[in-house]
Amino acid sequence: LRPSRVHNSEENTMRALTLKDILNGTFSYKTFFPNWISGQEYLHQSADNNIVLYNIETGQSYTILSNRTMKSVNASNYGLSPDRQFVYLESDYSKLWRYSYTATYYIYDLSNGEFVRGNELPRPIQYLCWSPVGSKLAYVYQNNIYLKQRPGDPPFQITFNGRENKIFNGIPDWVYEEEMLPTKYALWWSPNGKFLAYAEFNDKDIPVIAYSYYGDEQYPRTINIPYPKAGAKNPVVRIFIIDTTYPAYVGPQEVPVPAMIASSDYYFSWLTWVTDERVCLQWLKRVQNVSVLSICDFREDWQTWDCPKTQEHIEESRTGWAGGFFVSRPVFSYDAISYYKIFSDKDGYKHIHYIKDTVENAIQITSGKWEAINIFRVTQDSLFYSSNEFEEYPGRRNIYRISIGSYPPSKKCVTCHLRKERCQYYTASFSDYAKYYALVCYGPGIPISTLHDGRTDQEIKILEENKELENALKNIQLPKEEIKKLEVDEITLWYKMILPPQFDRSKKYPLLIQVYGGPCSQSVRSVFAVNWISYLASKEGMVIALVDGRGTAFQGDKLLYAVYRKLGVYEVEDQITAVRKFIEMGFIDEKRIAIWGWSYGGYVSSLALASGTGLFKCGIAVAPVSSWEYYASVYTERFMGLPTKDDNLEHYKNSTVMARAEYFRNVDYLLIHGTADDNVHFQNSAQIAKALVNAQVDFQAMWYSDQNHGLSGLSTNHLYTHMTHFLKQCFSLSD
């Protein structure tokens, strides 16, 4: 369901989108993800902030925690203990990096309707979670891990060496949080809560990035973050497991690192519990084309963890890096030794494989010139996964069920024909044993969330259909959207074109390219959005195009790994190629073409502007990378190798924006960055600006004081207003 476009009879009542609509979030949508607590029950926070328990079988709902209780501690989040005796209430949320934050936690006792007094939790806490069974608590405070057997008990301190910016226990350091896990936590309960595994990150030898935070004090603060840039010293990681029933008995036991990994710099990439006494760890060489999955067992006699070489599974890429963006995680079957995993097949497409003994003997479960994206759930008789197989559109996601209980296994698309026009991009959330599941459809029509029976796939009810949004859009002239492909030199370039509401092919329109283009990304997706570029098409009459070129994901390894060790070349070439093809279509004013991007997209847009093609009149780079030597080791080296003479230093040097400073002379360039960007440091734009000044090239710039990579809050409004003015001026559009 795409809201109705323009009906001539109603044309006078229809209006274009305004920038204000976008900045106010007038046309934002809601999704509904149940917080599953059993096979047939879930919790959801109601509009009036009560925490409500829904029982699907009986159709009944119950308020288990009132908004009054939530409000009494200004709680913004909650977590029910698995034994349903207690709820933690989270308040004083204070954001740190992308996922991490600190908060104050209160424990509410449901049996007597009172907050637990005595042995209260310290504040602020960096991470807190319940055990999977009962109501044990694990939490991280000041980089150390603590355990409580019951919420009112005194805590047991598990680690003692935690130190700010030096040793992190149970939480990741900056680079592991952003580029490897990527989570705010680094501790994992075993399925029944017998053991607690955790990572320790030692950042003592990592160089520190320091930047000023101006605040409103007389002297700015300096923010210091251990941040390994390409080629720098990396964190040293160790994994420990402790028995939570008798934590003081033998204390934390270290899990051994596979010998072939430990021989040089390495990363830990993920931990998956299989049973209470079997755990699976994934490791990765610093040169990220070799990954090892290691299955370890608890030795009762020695109270240690044994990881036999026979239970080591190696995944290696000969054409690129291991995995997609990350190395995929295993999903274990009920025998607790075999597992399902997504990795490249012999034809270079990511597919589901079943590994019983060795990777070499893996049984391929899915196959074709498309990719399996995510394994949601494996039950005794079914495997649920998502892919972009249907109708050969890589930017779609449908949910499939493979029956693994019967032979040969049969495959069914659960979502392909549900709401075909409205919904072509799904994710799913499953209850215990996949008894029920929620489908969340992101578009291309207005998003809708529905509840389904896990056995029959029958829709039970609509959880959220965004009726208010649908009504609000009834009198809006939304742009038209097309997703098509270009075939160029044996490369398929998928693109999304956003066209003004009264688009006429015989007229000429200004073109704006929006680019991200980072490795394993995808911009051309069949999703709903009413955003800044929707406004530019609807109100300002621009054509906007997004193009997925080489290096992008879900179309096979040939396209994905094309950029390996040479970032900044083909991504840019493919944007330029697409622009030339768009000009050939006849409706683009070739004197009014612009490009813009954020982060990796800012890097690509900068390089495109400095390509010397004369195609672009102007462009914008928001928070761009300018040299890969300035970015994080884990991300950069995955795609570029090391910046050393005997590895890939030459391309590190050749692929900088600064090296092309002279080429900006004939374009209008707007450079934008937040001064407190912890991710792509302000250093990147500072160096571009310096190179442009040294080359005596005129450009425009805007910095956002104390803003990070997201440029949020009031900065967002200022940013989009500023960029709008810049583009309208570039395209000679009146204000």
Epitope: S38, Q40, E41, L53, N55, E57, T58, Q60, Y62, I64, L80, D83, R84, Q85, D109, L110, S111, N112, G113
Partner: nanobody
């Protein structure tokens, strides 16, 4: 172990008054969460109200404001009271008990059950 026996059911007029009782045997009654379930013809058994050992109450949204659950630990009895029954409240009402939290709505999570008492609300 705890044995449960319901009473107080029967025919009642809409907007009349109804009080169900559930007597429990056993000395540790006070440590159990107690619940009232009901099952209408052709429907699954559903939790109507529950009360924790600490006295916190919990109601299905469909009966909230109309039904009241209470317990008397001295008498080893739990009650379900309503002053505004509706025809759709017609069902067999079962008393149930469990150790631990009252916040479970699936019958499988409640190990101890009474025999049930029929309640018919006439319009």
């Amino acid at each position: 172990q705890v044995q449960l026996q319901e009473s107080g059911g029967g025919l009642v007029e809409a907007e009349g008054s109804l009080r169900l009782s559930c007597a429990a045997s056993g000395r540790t009654f006070g440590s159990y969460a107690m619940g009232w379930f009901r099952q209408a013809p052709g429907k699954s058994r559903e939790l109507v109200a529950a009360i924790s050992s600490g006295g916190t109450t919990y109601y299905a949204d469909s009966v909230k404001g109309r039904f009241t659950i209470s317990r008397d630990n001295a008498r080893n009895t739990v009650y379900l009271q309503t002053n505004s029954p509706k025809p759709e409240d017609t069902a067999v009402y079962y008393c149930a008990a469990r150790t631990g939290s009252a916040y479970y709505t699936n019958r499988i999570d409640w190990p101890y059950w009474g025999q049930g008492t029929q309640v018919t609300v006439s319009s």
